[in-house]
Each structure stands twice: as C-alpha cells, then as structure tokens.
C-alpha cells in the first residue's frame, strides 16, 4: 500500500494505490483511491507512467481528456466515471502488454488540495493448473498442465503423505512456447504415484503462485486449484 500526500501550497489530500499485476492479453486494473470531493467538476485525475512522455489517462470536469495521451495507451484506458465522486480513481487497462510494466503515478487534484501516489505494476502471464491422472502412461502418473505463464515459472510437486519429499527425480517439466511467442504452456509429469494420497503441483514465478491439487482414492478423484498474486502491496 502506498499512501501519498500533496505538497503544494493548497492542502494536501491522501491518495492510496495498491501494487498489482497484469495478465498479458487480458484486462487489468490499476488501483487508486483518494479523499472524495462533493463536486465531480472539481476533480482531476491524471495517470502517468515513468519513462513515458504522454499521459496514460486524464479525467477532468467529469469527462475523459485524452489530448495528451501517449500513443501506447490509445483506446486502452478508462476510469470508472460513476465512481470518481466517491474517491475511486482506479484505471481500467485493456489488453495488457508486457511493456505496460513499470511505475505509475496516480495524481489527484480536488477543491481540497492535491496528492499523488506511485504504483508498481508488473506484467506477465499466469493461469490455473489442472492435474489429471495420465492413463496413457505405463506407470501411475499425474499430469499437471497450465496454459499460460511468463516469465518461465518453477514447478514443484508435493504430497500430503510424503511431506518434505523431493519429487524432482520422479518428475519431468516442459515449457512449450504459445503461438504469440511470449507466454508458455507448462506441463509437468509426476511418476510412481501412490493411491490414497493428495498431490500438489505448485507453479510459481515472480508475479503469481498457483497450485493444483489432486486426491486419488480407489473410488474417486478430487481436484482443486487456486491462484494467488504475489505482489499486491498497497502504497
């Protein structure tokens, strides 16, 4: 969490941002809140990016104002116009690109004063893994697949029964470049699995950590997966 304060002659206002991550090719949100004003026409929101000449987005007098917008953000940004009055200056970003990563500034002017806060935005690719029993294999084998990751993640297997065991000798992980030549498909195979055990396939890079669990018993197979972003820090 980054909390910024204004430093002008006018009163300063508190602006709060939260570091976040964007999944390339999908839509992202850059979070920013501020002390609200009673009049929408008195609020100015400017989003800036370090190293970029033009603005990312500007909203003033109740409308978007993109005359100074940098070309790399054309057609890709919007604020939640109906929520500005309650202090939400968050930016919606369409079709997140790898190059969108960097330091952003959320700069606010209201009738109460000015304030700003920085936000670190990471970009990459992350997806939920799915673990299945590989019936085509000669031995009892599990296959963990996740369609989109970038940068290249690490893959670690774990088991409930053999806690702390190192499965690197009995697993094989491959990374296959996807058609857009950036993200990769992750496939990891675990051999010699035993029945009545829960196995976890953990995929992690510097942006996200995802886990796919599978419980195999005589009578059924249960699956569960979850994904967690690693860098959601507020400012």
């Amino acid at each position: 969490l980054i909390i910024g304060f204004g430093i002008s002659g006018r009163h300063s206002i508190t602006v709060t941002t939260v570091a976040s991550a964007g999944n390339i090719g999908e839509d992202g949100i850059l979070s920013c809140t501020f002390e609200p004003d009673i009049k929408l026409s008195d609020i100015v929101i400017q989003w800036l990016k370090e190293g970029v000449l033009g603005l990312v987005h500007e909203f003033k007098e109740g409308k978007d104002e993109l005359s100074e917008q940098d070309e790399m953000f054309r057609g890709r940004t919007a604020v939640f116009a109906d929520q500005v009055i309650v202090g939400n200056a968050s930016l919606r970003l369409k079709n997140v690109q790898l190059t969108d990563a960097g330091t952003y500034k959320c700069y606010i002017i209201t009738s109460k004063g000015k304030g700003n806060a920085n936000l670190e935005y990471k970009t990459g690719a992350f997806s939920m893994p799915e673990v299945n029993v590989d019936y085509n294999a000669s031995s009892e084998t599990l296959r963990c697949e996740a369609p989109r990751w970038f940068p290249q993640p690490t893959v670690v297997w774990a088991s409930q029964v053999d806690q702390g065991a190192n499965f690197s000798e009995v697993s094989n992980t491959s990374f296959e470049l996807n058609s857009e030549n950036v993200t990769m498909k992750v496939v990891s195979v675990l051999y010699n699995v035993t029945i009545n055990n829960t196995y976890s396939c953990m995929i992690e890079n510097d942006i996200a950590k995802a886990t796919g669990d599978i419980k195999v018993t005589e009578s059924e197979i249960k699956r569960r997966s979850h994904l967690q972003l690693l860098n959601s820090k507020a400012s």
């Epitope: 090719g25 999908e26 839509d27 409308k63 978007d64 104002e65 993109l66 005359s67 917008q69 070309e71 054309r74 057609g75 890709r76 940004t77 919007a78 919606r92 369409k94 079709n95 058609s179 857009e180």
Partner: antibody
Framework: QVQLQESGPGLVKPSQTLSLTCTVS??????????WSWIRQHPGKGLEWIGN???????YYNPSLRSRVTMSVDTSKNQFSLKLSSVTAADTAVYYC?????????????WGQGTLVTVSS | DIQMTQSPSTLSASVGDRVTITCRAS??????LAWYQQKPGKAPKLLIY???SLHSGVPSRFSGSGSGTEFTLTISSLQPDDFATYYC?????????FGGGTKVEIK
C-alpha cells in the same frame, strides 16, 4: 441524441482523392470521452474499419490503408473528415462515420446513414 | 491483425425459432466483442457490446456470450423484424476488425 451525417461527392475519378465529411449534431465532437471513426463497406461485402480520430486531432489508421488515409477534425464546425488518395475501383464502397461507445470500448454507436462513393472514370 | 470468422454465413430460420450465430477470433480478445444487425441499404445497428452487454433499446430476445476466442449471438425467439445480416467486431486491439457476416433469411 447524437446524430452523424456523411457528405461528399458520390463519384470520384481513379487516381484522385476521395474526400468526405461527417457532421455531428446533438452533441459536441469535443467531448473527450469518444473517438470518431470511419468504416467502409464494399458493395455486397463486409465491413472494414478505416481509422479513428480524437477531437484534438490525434489519429490511428488501419495499416492496410495508412499510406493513403488522412483524417482531420474541425471542432468549430463539429465535423471530422476523411481523405483517401490515389483511389481505384477497389475503393468503391459505402462510407460510414461512427462514434465509439467510450475511450476504452469502441463498439460503434451511433452511425451515419452512409454515403456511396463510386470510383469510375 | 485479428481475424474474425463467423458461422454460418447464411442461416435459414422461421419466426419463433431460437437462432445462434458463432464468431471466432484468431487470438484471444477477452470480452471485447460487439454484435451488429444490418438491413439492406441501412447502417449497422449495435446490439451487444463487451460480448454480453445489451445495448440500450435492443430487445431482450438478443443475448451475447463468450470470452477469449469463441462468442455467440443468440436470438431466443426470432421475430419478422430480425431477418437481416449480423456482424461481429473485435475492439480488443488495433486495427479493429469485423466478421464476414451471417445472413438470417426466412426458411
């Protein structure tokens, strides 16, 4: 509500420049929340997006036509314009002007009624 | 450029039928897809934006679904006024592109 109306010559000679204007009524072209687009439709065929312009004059053109397209805006007249140079018979089409829904969502509404431009000597 | 492929190109149906038109994108476009209806000699009319949001004034028999690369437009009960050509359009990235169209005609 906002309405758009295309105007310009219906007949252009090959190698010349096609010029069209879109007049906006019921709203201001200077409203910063929108991009303004040109779209064309060849006879009996599908739709092709030509490009868009912001009220400040910044533009984005479809790369397939970029070398021949120029768009401009006249905020005092609430108009934006399209020029397409070095036309051939392949540029014969109905030309539409349209407004995007917002700065981030460029689904198009409203549209002008369209104007047929024929390229022929 | 992102290619948009519509199917079928022509669809014969009767009043009251449930009609489904498919649009496929050559790469993921998230939910940035619009659907239009066009009648001969007229400009296209926006029906659906952001894949599933019904545009104001459009009858509720029209609905859109899908995300990523596969999208559908459904007309729950075809009305006489619905015989027209339908286009999808992606606005995920420049240049914006349209599908080839689906003509819905009377069976």
């Amino acid at each position: 509500q906002v309405q758009l109306q295309e105007s310009g010559p219906g007949l252009v000679k090959p190698s010349q420049t096609l010029s069209l204007t879109c007049t906006v009524s019921g709203g201001s072209i200077s409203d910063g929340s929108y991009y303004w687009s040109w779209i064309r439709q060849h006879p009996g065929k599908g739709l092709e997006w030509i490009g868009n312009i912001y009220y400040s004059g910044s533009t984005y053109y479809n790369p397939s036509l970029r070398s021949r397209v120029t768009m401009s805006v006249d905020t005092s007249k609430n108009q934006f314009s399209l020029k397409l140079s070095s036309v051939t018979a392949a540029d014969t089409a109905v030309y539409y002007c349209a407004r995007g829904l917002s700065t981030i969502d460029e689904a198009f509404d409203p549209w002008g009624q369209g104007t047929l431009v024929t390229v022929s000597s | 450029d992102i290619q948009m492929t519509q199917s079928p190109s022509t669809l014969s149906a009767s009043v009251g039928d449930r009609v489904t038109i498919t649009c496929r994108a050559s790469k993921s476009i998230s939910s940035w897809l619009a659907w239009y209806q066009q009648k001969p000699g007229k400009a296209p009319k926006l029906l659906i934006y952001e894949a599933s949001s019904l545009h104001s004034g459009v009858p509720s028999r029209f609905s859109g679904s899908g995300s990523g690369t596969e999208f559908t437009l459904t007309i729950s009960s075809l009305q006489p006024d619905d015989f027209a050509t339908y286009y999808c359009q992606q606005d995920n990235s420049y240049p914006y592109t349209f599908g080839g169209g689906t003509k819905v005609e009377i069976k």
